[in-house]
């Protein structure tokens, strides 16, 4: 059986497979996918190797119509190294010569100039290029490597793997060399993988039951090492509680080296931020941190100083805590908007079972603009998602020069934020540097500012205008209103009528379905109409609503269904990569971003149109 | 690496007791299993007891069951075998051995034996 890094090299020309006779002879087949001699992978970012020989593809030399065969691999050779040029085209590295089907005389797979059909290569069974099954680093843990990848295939007794082994060893544990040949290199790790007593690498609290592993001995960047975690479906550590930090401090006290963390500021316009989502709530620096040093955007906890934490360039290499298992967040659920009726009093505006007021005018420092909201039967704003925020922001009348108290605040304990209405802190949203926490400036309350709606601590005696928000009454069935210019059953906002489609159907139905209400897939414009669209859609349980963006008319070249321009993205994190299809908005916990899926997958999706009575603007002219 | 050091063996009358202890040091990360073995002059080695990492689940082999337990301190990264009842046919030499997590890919380590001689 073909694992999911396994692949078949096909020529739709020919309807034929790469084949490895012999090492000295690759040549082509009718495919099979249970002919081993069939089967290639990835084993770095530019090396295939024959799952079979457990040898690699390359050339003797770089020049036009040579016969590609298996060598050794090697890692360093220019010869063995291949990548895909535009489609499907696969090339070596650097040159225009082309992985080529050979002739009729020529039964062998050539090195080749032409770039036709006959160097054109897909895997068997997909539309993808070679490179869609790409290669993932595996760090390794324990062992005497600092961590480094697996190098697949290595050599251990003379024998070539190419996948962890637990040869050598009687209790079952899978690990690596970390070099070709581990007999002379004598360097290796554990894999992280799924084996019997691999939860011993881990530490698990018994108060909470999350589990911490602490990788001491590594060596890595921020960025692998919260790969590492991943590879064992967890996150690099995030701290949201003192007995969380306590337990830590406890865990690597006798340690002395900093040890990376999930914090960090890499989002381009907003502050510090828990890899995992977490939110940021919790603050342990080290006296003079967080420095204010550009590219200082990762953070690593250190043993030899209480286990305080220190802004570093994120290229340092350190060792790193991963974190898994069970968070306390997930206990505070909020109701969707759809399932609670909400009615408000006049000037308060609606959303999920509570009502909102900001009030602008009437400046007040933080203690006042608490007791006024609590006077009015409710309290200083908290917020609790994403889509929470984006209704402020989208359908409050916030404005972008606005700085208004919301109800977070490290008043009662020092450098641990709650909520004024002692709601659990679930999310947080800093501004780009925030929190800042100048000690020489007590900032111990919390604003909203700027265009976003990002926050930023401030000291408590400003006075500034504030947001308020209390539980909305129920009345019993909730009245639907019909909303000004828009049909029963669809939203407005600003100039636009949408729609929930609540059938799951592909991007084509659904495209079809919106055609048939006289609207289209939804566009999405700019960051407003994302946010209202987050805040729409964001808490339902469906995981994906469908968008009007796809690269079907242009692979690679993402377009909206109606002839409209793309000025305007939301990507979740590593989208929309290499992949073709059809672009979804995500709920849940990474609600609004959007990622690509098979097109044929079947999702709800969200219509709009323009709402009636409503002067087109003229487009913009670039 | 790793280094396993028993100790505790000597000449004993049938019918007395014994306490062999084997303490593993070196670089190592867990203990996943251990075990004493035994070799009587001609024999094979055969198992004796051995005690999982984990769990501390344990394994005692028929012909010492009853008479012998064996129990590990984590702490000291120490395995006893406790002896009681010896018979003429239990003098042998007792190796130790680990399966250890360490610096290397291999997973066995092996002490170099302590005899244990049971005669009047």
């Known amino acids: 059986l073909l694992d999911t890094r396994q692949f078949l090299i096909y020529n739709e020309d020919h309807k034929r497979c790469v084949d490895a006779v012999s090492p000295s002879a690759v040549q082509t087949a009718a495919c099979n996918q249970d002919a081993e001699s069939q089967k290639f992978r990835w084993v770095s970012e530019s090396q295939i190797m024959s799952v079979a020989f457990k040898l690699c593809l390359g050339v003797p030399s770089k020049t036009d119509w040579v016969a590609i065969t298996l060598y050794a691999c090697d890692s360093k050779s220019e010869f063995q190294k291949w990548e895909c040029k535009n489609d499907t085209l696969l090339g070596i590295k650097g040159e225009d010569l082309f992985f080529n089907y050979g002739n009729r005389q020529e039964k062998n797979i050539m090195l080749y100039k032409g770039s036709g059909l006959w160097s054109r290569w897909k895997i068997y069974g997909t539309t993808d290029n070679l490179c869609s099954r790409g290669y993932e680093a595996m760090y390794t843990l324990l062992g005497n490597a600092n961590g480094a990848t697996c190098a697949f295939p290595f050599k251990f007794e003379n024998k070539w793997y190419a996948d962890c082994t637990s040869a050598g060893r009687s209790d079952g544990w899978l690990w690596c060399g970390t070099t070709t040949d581990y007999d002379t290199d004598k360097l290796f790790g554990y894999c992280p993988l799924k084996f019997e007593g691999s939860e011993s690498l881990w530490n698990k609290d018994p108060l909470t039951s999350v589990s911490y592993q602490i990788n001491s001995k590594s060596a890595l960047t921020w960025h692998q090492a919260r790969k590492s975690c991943q590879q064992q479906n967890a996150e690099l550590l995030s701290i949201t509680e003192i007995h969380e930090q306590t337990y830590l401090t406890g865990l690597t006290s006798s340690l002395t080296s900093g040890l990376w963390i999930g914090l960090n500021s890499l989002s381009f316009n907003s502050g510090w931020q828990w890899s995992d989502r977490s939110p940021f709530r919790y603050l342990n620096w080290l006296p003079g941190s967080p420095s204010a040093e550009p590219g200082k955007s990762c953070v690593s906890l250190n043993p030899g100083k209480n286990a305080k934490w220190e802004n570093l360039e994120c290229v340092q290499k350190l060792g790193y805590i991963c974190k898994k298992g069970n968070t306390t967040l997930n206990s505070f659920v909020i109701p969707s908007e759809s399932d609670v009726p909400t009615h408000c009093p006049s000037q308060w505006w609606p959303y999920a079972g509570h009502c909102y007021k900001i009030h602008r005018d009437e400046k007040k420092i933080q203690r006042d603009a608490l007791t006024t909201c609590r006077k009015e039967g409710g309290d200083l704003t908290s917020i609790h998602t994403i889509e929470e925020l984006d209704f402020i922001i989208s359908q409050l009348g916030y404005e972008p020069n606005d700085e208004l108290w919301i109800g977070l605040n490290d008043i009662k304990i020092q450098m641990y934020f709650e909520w004024s209405d002692g709601t659990p802190v679930t999310f947080t949203k800093w501004l780009r540097g925030e929190p800042s926490h100048e000690n020489n400036r007590q900032e111990d309350c919390v604003v909203m500012k700027g265009k976003d709606g990002y926050w930023a601590d401030r000291g408590c005696e400003w006075p500034l205008g504030y947001i308020c928000k209390m539980k909305s009454r129920s009345q019993g069935p909730e009245i639907v209103e019909v909303e000004k210019g828009c049909r029963k059953g669809w939203k407005k906002h600003h100039f636009y009528c949408y729609m929930i489609g609540h059938t799951l159907s592909t991007f084509a139905e659904a495209n079809q379905t919106c055609n048939n209400e006289n609207a289209y897939l939804t566009t999405i414009e700019d960051r407003y109409e994302q946010a209202f669209l987050t805040s729409f859609v964001g808490l339902r349980p469906e995981k994906y609503f469908w968008t009007g963006l796809s690269d079907i008319q242009t692979k690679g070249t993402f377009q909206w269904t109606i002839e409209e321009e793309v000025r305007f993205t939301h990507w979740n994190s590593d989208m929309p990569g290499r992949k073709p299809g059809c672009v979804a908005m995500r709920t849940g916990i990474a609600g609004g971003l959007w990622d690509v899926l098979k097109c044929d997958e079947k999702a709800k999706f969200v219509c709009k149109h323009w709402a009636e009575g409503v002067t087109h603007p003229p487009k913009p002219t670039t | 690496d790793v280094q396993l050091v028993e100790s505790g063996g000597g000449l004993v009358q049938p019918g007395g007791s014994l306490r062999l202890s084997c303490a593993a040091s070196?670089?190592?990360?867990?203990?996943?299993?251990m075990a004493w073995f035994r070799q009587a002059p001609g024999k094979e080695r055969e198992i004796v007891a051995a005690v999982n990492g984990g769990s501390s689940s344990t394994y005692v082999a028929d012909s010492v069951k009853g008479r012998f337990t064996i129990s590990r301190d984590n702490a000291k990264n120490t395995v006893y075998l406790q002896m009681n009842s010896l018979k003429p046919e239990d003098t042998a030499v007792y190796y130790c051995k680990a399966v250890v997590v360490t610096t290397t890919p291999y997973s066995d380590y092996w002490g170099q034996g302590t005899l244990v001689t049971v005669s009047s």
């Open positions: 070196g670089s190592i990360f867990t203990i996943n299993a």
